[in-house]
Amino acid sequence: DAEFRHDSGYEVHHQKLVFFAEDVGSNKGAIIGLMVGGVVIA
C-alpha cells in the first residue's frame, strides 16, 4: 500500500533570538552578542 501523505515527523521548536549591544566604555568600543534561549553564543 502507498503511504498517506504526512509531514516529516520532527517538530520544530521555536526559540527567541536576541541581539544585544553593550557599551563598556568610551575607549573600549562595544561588545556585540547573540543570545539564544538565554545563552550567549557569540
Partner: antibody, heavy 122, light 112 residues
Framework: QVTLKESGPGILQPSQTLSLTCSFS??????????VSWIRQPSGKGLEWLAH???????RYNPSLKSRLTISKDTSRNQVFLKITSVDTADAGTYYC??????????????WGQGTSVTVSL | DVLMTQTPLSLPVSLGDQASISCRSS???????????LEWYLQKPGQSPNLLIY???NRFSGVPDRFSGSGSGTDFTLKISRVEAEDLGVYYC?????????FGAGTKLELK
C-alpha cells in the same frame, strides 16, 4: 469555531452520478497542511474512508472506488466536492466530510460534519 | 489494504467499570516519518464520529483523562478507566498511515 456541513441530493436512481458538497468555516483550505476527507457509512454498518484533498490540490482515493470517485475543492468558497459515478444501492448511506490537517500537532480527523443521508432507489 | 481487527465487537459494561478495546493492524502502521497514525473515534447513537485519541496515545482537546490509548507496531488498546453513561456508543480504531485509510469494524460499548 470549526464547522463542516455536508449536502447532497438525498435520493437518486441507480446509474446516476452522486454529487456531494462539504461547506466549512473556521479554517481555510489555502492554509498549508490543511486537508479534507470524505467518509461514508451504510445504514447500521461501519465507516469507510473514500478520498482526501490537500491544500495544494494533491488528492488521495480509496483504490477500491478510485475509478468512480472525483474529489475537488473551491478554496475561495470554503467548499469541497465529491462525485461518485454509476451509483448502486450499495452506495446508499450517510456521507461525512472531516477536516484532517497534516501540519498541526493533531494530525487526525479532528472535526466532522453532521453527515448527509443518501438513498439509491428505482 | 491494512485490515484493522477490533475485539470485542460488543462490550457490555456496568457504569464505573473499566473497559478495554483491542485493535490489531494486519501490518505495521508506523509511517516513514516515524509517527504511528493510529486513532480512536467514538460514534454516539445518531451522531457523527468524534476524535478521542490520535497518534496512539494523545487525547484530543476536551477528551476526559479516563480515556487512554497505548500500543505500538500492530497492537493497540483503548482503555476507559471508569465508564460513564456518556461513553456509550461505537468505538472505531483507524489507521492513517497507508492508503486506503481504514477503520476497524467497531466495538459497541453498551450497558449490561
Amino acid at each position: 469555531q470549526v464547522t463542516l456541513k455536508e449536502s447532497g441530493p438525498g435520493i437518486l436512481q441507480p446509474s446516476q452520478t452522486l454529487s456531494l458538497t462539504c461547506s466549512f468555516s473556521g479554517f481555510s483550505l489555502s492554509t498549508s497542511g490543511m486537508g479534507v476527507s470524505w467518509i461514508r457509512q451504510p445504514s447500521g454498518k461501519g465507516l469507510e474512508w473514500l478520498a482526501h484533498i490537500y491544500w495544494d490540490d494533491d488528492k488521495r482515493y480509496n483504490p477500491s472506488l478510485k475509478s468512480r470517485l472525483t474529489i475537488s475543492k473551491d478554496t475561495s468558497r470554503n467548499q469541497v466536492f465529491l462525485k461518485i459515478t454509476s451509483v448502486d444501492t450499495a452506495d446508499a448511506g450517510t456521507y461525512y466530510c472531516a477536516r484532517r490537517p497534516i501540519r498541526t500537532v493533531v494530525d487526525a480527523m479532528d472535526y466532522w460534519g453532521q453527515g448527509t443521508s443518501v438513498t439509491v432507489s428505482l | 489494504d491494512v485490515l484493522m481487527t477490533q475485539t470485542p465487537l460488543s462490550l457490555p459494561v456496568s457504569l464505573g467499570d473499566q473497559a478495554s478495546i483491542s485493535c490489531r493492524s494486519s501490518q505495521t502502521i508506523v509511517h516513514s516519518n516515524g509517527n504511528t497514525y493510529l486513532e480512536w473515534y467514538l460514534q454516539k447513537p445518531g451522531q457523527s464520529p468524534n476524535l478521542l485519541i490520535y497518534k496512539v496515545s494523545n487525547r484530543f482537546s476536551g477528551v476526559p483523562d479516563r480515556f487512554s490509548g497505548s500500543g505500538s507496531g500492530t497492537d493497540f488498546t483503548l482503555k476507559i478507566s471508569r465508564v460513564e453513561a456518556e461513553d456509550l456508543g461505537v468505538y472505531y480504531c483507524f489507521q492513517g498511515s497507508h492508503v486506503p485509510l481504514t477503520f476497524g469494524a467497531g466495538t459497541k460499548l453498551e450497558l449490561k
